[in-house]
């Protein structure tokens, strides 16, 4: 990643700690899983991508930050809030839900590196497990004891 | 040769949906980023969203409150825009842009398309 | 959603006038920045990428400055052709904003 402009610590600072901060928290995406907002249909499709084929089908939204390595990030939405019959691939079937299926990613953030005196010395990566959205699995409801 | 030809003027009325097309040549369709960009008569650029060709992945801009669908036919190596719920003030050239990315430091339209006029019109 | 405000709304200026445009964001955005230039009846051209880098075939008389929340575009020796309305367009965050145009006219 040196190719970012300042990213990188002065001579003589320790690359193993200054660069790589570990945070073991998982940043949340920027935003909250939610029901699909735009008409795109719900049901499975007999060819194309393995999301469109799917009987719990999603779309990709994009994340972009700037500071942050990758800068594009994509979050699975599901379109239908229960799984698809394989039988039409239109018509739901309230017995399965449509879930998302979530990955810790590690990411690294760019922050601005201070020297002894806390003076300003470029920028350091930071890393830091983010989570994303990978794909709709099609699952059992949980039964509630 | 970069070429990005999008479909033709449309006429429609208010409440009705359009589908504007933008086919891409002369780069790998999948390694780009599209935008659709639109300018009312007189007024400034407005971004409507994007999508990645790639995986279909989009980002839609919120002030046209989910009136906006992104989609894309890699085969045919075209981007659509369409735009539901239309009324007078959606008047205006619809543009298709492609993205330039270095990997860290910029993103940037380089190649735009010729521009397709939607007139709402009762 | 960033604000890009641009001044001046429009300028007449003689052919080999330095000419300064200006554009500012209503917050940060580093040197986030693309500079976009219209003709009269034709499409947007990328212009300036990155605040300053001057995108390929762009004349060296155009170029960019600034950082964080004011930025400048610059054409060192007016020419004829560039006869157009200029478009600032911060892409720091989403979703991407334009400044609503500067028109350059020939005196």
């Known amino acids: 990643y040196s190719h970012w402009p300042s990213c990188c610590p002065s001579k003589g600072q320790d690359t193993s700690e200054e660069l790589l901060r570990w945070s073991t928290v998982p940043v949340p995406p920027l935003e909250p899983a939610r029901p699909n907002r735009h008409p795109e249909s719900c049901r499975a499709s007999e060819d194309g991508p393995l999301n469109s084929r799917a009987i719990s089908p999603w779309r990709y939204e994009l994340d972009r930050d700037l500071n942050r390595l990758p800068q594009d990030l994509y979050h699975a939405r599901c379109l239908c809030p229960h799984c698809v019959s394989l039988q039409t691939g239109s018509h739901m079937d309230p017995r399965g839900n449509s879930e998302l299926l979530y990955h810790n990613q590690t990411v690294f953030y760019r922050r601005p590196c201070h020297g002894e005196k806390g003076t300003h010395k470029g920028y350091c990566l930071e890393r830091r497990l983010y989570r994303v959205s990978l794909a709709c699995v099609c699952v059992r409801p949980r039964v509630m004891g | 040769e970069v070429q990005l030809v999008e479909s033709g003027a449309e006429v429609k009325k208010p409440g009705a949906s359009v589908k504007v097309s933008c086919k891409a040549s002369?780069?790998?369709?999948?390694?780009?980023?599209m935008n659709w960009v639109r300018q009312a008569p007189g007024q400034r650029l407005e971004w409507m969203g994007l999508i990645n060709p790639y995986n279909g992945g989009t980002s839609y801009n919120q002030n046209f409150k989910g009136r906006v669908t992104l989609t894309r036919d890699t085969s045919a190596s075209t981007a659509y825009l369409e735009l539901n719920s239309l009324r007078s003030e959606d008047t205006g050239v619809y543009y298709c842009?492609?993205?330039?990315?270095?990997?860290?430091?910029?993103?940037?339209?380089?190649?735009w398309g010729q521009g397709t006029l939607v007139t709402v019109s009762s | 959603d960033i604000q890009m405000t641009q001044s001046p709304s429009s300028l007449s200026a003689s052919v080999g006038d330095r000419v300064t445009i200006t554009c500012s964001a209503s917050q940060g955005i580093s040197n986030y920045l693309n500079w976009y230039q219209q003709k009269p009846g034709k499409v947007p051209k990328l212009l300036i990428y990155y605040t300053s880098s001057l995108h390929s075939g762009v004349p060296s008389r155009f170029s960019g400055s600034g950082s964080g929340t004011d930025f400048t575009l610059t054409i060192s020796s007016l020419q004829p052709e560039d006869v157009a309305t200029y478009y600032c367009q911060q892409y720091s965050k989403l979703p991407y904003t334009f400044g609503q145009g500067t028109k350059l006219e020939i005196k």
């Open positions: 002369g780069y790998s369709f999948t390694g780009y980023t």
């Open positions: 842009a492609r993205e330039d990315y270095d990997g860290y430091l910029y993103f940037a339209m380089d190649y």
